[in-house]
């Protein structure tokens, strides 16, 4: 019997016996095609599929649709691991997604859906979340029912203005709604009263850019 | 940066008047609306009054109906509640705070609280004989 060589996410990683955090080769469900994430083999459990991650400002992330779908940054700083991966991945299994922030006062706070899946890209990677529970608030900075993603060349959102070109950065925006974790990156003591920043407002209010997020996703079933 | 200052809160007995500013740095009212907020101790912070200077458009919380006037002078960049007929349940911190203009949902007329991204500091109205 050959032995299983490919990974379709960072929970069969770890179930392999690969229980160190870093960055791992991942193959797209039913297909060849790779992608490079980071493992959080340490959070609560280990077997988490970084998504997203923010830190310190280092990566652009007012990107076009395609760079949103695809993918940009580095898995071991500031990064996006692309929608069309995260769709196909979360499309076939039943995923929580679990949202870790920092504010600039030494606090932290998460956000945990117990199921997660974006739609693809037919439907504009619509954002689906069901069952929140968690520190950084009883109600969800992601608008319900989940919204289409939106970049700055591509605008899904439901308001009269362009909220990827207004707030920056792509997102599933409302009108503009209550979050935004992919907006301008502003350092401690400019970080109030931003119109752009990264936002999750049922945590920190409005007007509050975050100083880190983590977005990662697990099999609910893991 | 932008930065909205508070003024023109304190004690008044039921009945009477005040007259709060909200001076605006950093952005034009062209561009922005502006609401006051007020949050009572124990309460959730709430909507009162807004104003797009830009067409001229006003809102009002149903509480404030007929006794609150909000107005603008872009020359000033400031924004004023004049508040009239003042009750005992409208003592409560004043903020004012901004959102840009065009943040608006298709066939809405007003903003949710959480679009608001820029907030004063604060000012205590008291109503009390």
């Known amino acids: 019997k050959e032995e299983k060589t490919t990974f379709r996410d960072c929970a069969e990683i770890f179930k392999s016996g690969l229980t160190t955090s870093g960055i791992y080769t991942l193959t797209f469900p039913n297909s060849t095609e790779e992608v490079k994430a980071y493992c959080d083999m340490d959070m609560g459990g280990g077997g988490w599929t970084v998504i997203q991650h923010r830190e310190d400002g280092s990566v652009d992330f007012q990107r076009t649709w395609k760079e949103y779908k695809e993918g940009f940054g580095s898995p071991l700083g500031e990064y996006w691991l692309g929608n069309e991966f995260v769709s196909q991945l979360t499309s076939g299994h039943r995923y929580v997604l679990k949202i870790q922030l920092k504010d600039w006062e030494g606090s932290e706070a998460h956000s945990l859906y117990e199921h997660f899946y974006l739609s693809g890209e037919e439907s504009n990677y619509r954002i689906h979340l069901t069952g929140l529970t968690g520190t950084a608030g009883k109600i969800s900075s992601i608008s319900q029912p989940g919204s289409d993603f939106s970049t700055k060349d591509s605008d899904n959102d439901k308001c009269i203005c362009k909220c990827s070109q207004m707030l920056t950065g792509g997102w599933w925006f409302d009108a503009c709604g209550p979050s935004n974790l992919n907006g301008q990156y502003y350092p401690q003591k400019q970080n109030t009263n931003k119109f752009n920043g990264i936002k999750w407002y049922y945590w920190k209010g409005s007007g509050y850019s975050l100083k880190a997020t983590t977005m990662m996703i697990r099999p609910a079933d893991f | 940066d932008v930065q909205l200052v508070e003024s023109g809160g304190g004690l008044v007995q039921p009945g009477g008047s005040l007259r709060l500013s909200c001076a605006v740095s950093g952005i034009t009212l062209d561009d922005y609306a502006i609401g006051w907020f007020r949050q009572a101790p124990g309460k959730e912070r709430e909507g009162v009054s807004a104003?797009?200077?830009?067409?001229?458009?006003?809102y009002y919380a149903d509480s404030v109906k007929g006794r609150f006037t909000i107005s603008s002078d872009n020359s000033k960049n400031t924004v004023y509640l004049q508040m009239n007929s003042l009750r005992p349940e409208d003592t409560a911190v004043y903020y004012c705070?901004?959102?840009?203009?065009?943040?608006?949902?298709?066939?809405?007329?007003?903003?949710?609280?959480?679009?608001?991204?820029?907030w004063g500091q604060g000012t205590l109205v008291t109503v009390s004989s």
């Open positions: 104003i797009r200077s830009s067409g001229g458009s006003t």
């Open positions: 705070a901004a959102v840009p203009a065009g943040r608006l949902r298709y066939g809405e007329q007003w903003y949710p609280i959480y679009e608001y991204d820029a």
